[in-house]
């Protein structure tokens, strides 16, 4: 084969957002017949030669960035995309509200606001069923997530988290769920 071996995939099951003391499994998946897998925790000098890492109880020290590669013969693959493993429940939950309210007409606008008593500068908003968050690039304590021209696809259950940019993998507990209802569709 010419060029480097293709990169494997790295995933966290059931999720990369892991409440403290709950289990999670990191799984590196390459092609069949791999000689050796290497799973690394970045910025810690740690590695292990296994495709699967089972964490029976999530700890603060295990939060961070992970990456994996594999070796066939003397050749190493390209590294996987980095996986960000986040410990949640490290801090008290923020509150999530909708302005002007949780019921909004199709085509209207709504702003979801995540509020915390602590001096966190980062917020993440998740919609149930979506793997990726709506991340807020702004840094303020009263985090606003405007949703312009609402459609039926925006209806659902939302939760937000707060955290500090100094410790980006240690998050609060999730807010209580907020049900966004889109009417007139």
């Amino acid at each position: 084969q010419s060029g480097p071996l293709p990169k494997p995939s790295l995933q966290a099951l059931p999720s990369s957002l892991v409440p403290l003391e709950k289990p999670v499994t990191l799984r590196c998946q390459g092609p069949p017949g791999v000689d050796l897998y290497r799973l690394e925790k970045l910025s810690s000098s740690r590695y292990q030669d296994q495709a699967v890492l089972f964490i029976p109880a999530m700890k603060r020290s295990l939060a961070g960035r992970y990456r994996c590669s594999y070796q066939n013969g003397s050749l190493w693959s390209l590294p996987s995309d980095q996986l960000e493993l986040v410990a949640t429940g490290v801090f008290a939950k923020p509150s999530l509200s909708a302005q002007p309210g949780p019921a909004v007409s199709s085509g209207g606008d709504v702003t979801l606001q995540c509020q915390t008593r602590y001096g966190f500068d980062q917020f993440a908003l998740y919609k149930e069923g979506d793997p990726a968050p709506y991340k807020n690039p702004e840094r303020w304590y009263r985090a606003s997530f405007p949703i312009i021209t609402v459609t039926a696809a925006h209806s659902g259950t939302y939760r937000c988290y707060s955290f500090s940019s100094r410790d980006p993998y240690l998050w609060s507990a999730p807010s209580d769920p907020l049900e966004l209802v889109v009417t007139g569709t």
Epitope: S45, Q48, W76
Partner: antibody, heavy 123, light 112 residues
Framework: QVQLVESGGGLVKPGGSLRLSCAAS????????VSWIRQAPGKGLEWVSA????????QYAESVKGRFTISRDNAKNSLYLQMNSLRAEDTAVYYC????????????????WGQGTLVTVSS | QSVLTQPPSVSGAPGQRVTISCTGS?????????VHWYQQLPGTAPKLLIY???NRPSGVPDRFSGSKSGTSASLAITGLQAEDEADYYC???????????FGGGTKLTVLG
Amino acid sequence: QVQLVESGGGLVKPGGSLRLSCAASGFSFGDYYVSWIRQAPGKGLEWVSAIGGSGSAVQYAESVKGRFTISRDNAKNSLYLQMNSLRAEDTAVYYCARHYREFRWHYYYFDYWGQGTLVTVSS
Amino acid sequence: QSVLTQPPSVSGAPGQRVTISCTGSSSNIGAGYDVHWYQQLPGTAPKLLIYGNSNRPSGVPDRFSGSKSGTSASLAITGLQAEDEADYYCQSHDLGAHVWVFGGGTKLTVLG
């Protein structure tokens, strides 16, 4: 306490072979990655080869690939380096070094080193 | 030619502070790998001095400290003493072929 003692160095002609040994004591040898690291006279450190605890995971520096073979015998707490097709530029003190380990994790640094054994390749 | 770049030599008077730099690239230090430092006294084997960028093994005086930023790292020695005269090596890991890499070494001379 942890001890690593290298042996087997000596004078060898270019193209010749030599087998280095490293006797380990004071720790559970089979749980640890170990490496060979060399230092040419008056020069810096160069990593040569590493081997995982079970012996199945091995890695080599490009400069020795195909000529050197690392192996271990966990029953004898010993690490080996078989060096073939030796060249003048392989002349160096060869150290064996243990990689730090904690729980199930290995680490990318060396916490204990042997005193080294000198290999001289010259006609 | 070493993968990590260090100055060949540094010097300082007793009691002074000196720093030794270690510059890598996006495939080693910049790829999320830590930097570790070793001290090699004349005629002896290297000894681990700093691990994980800034951590000291037990027995290493707090006059020695390390830091990392981006693709480079540095070792600082304060209150320089005659017994600090040695060669210092930085070490990291390289993502390309998963090999361990060293700097070329820096000879520290304590003046006077």
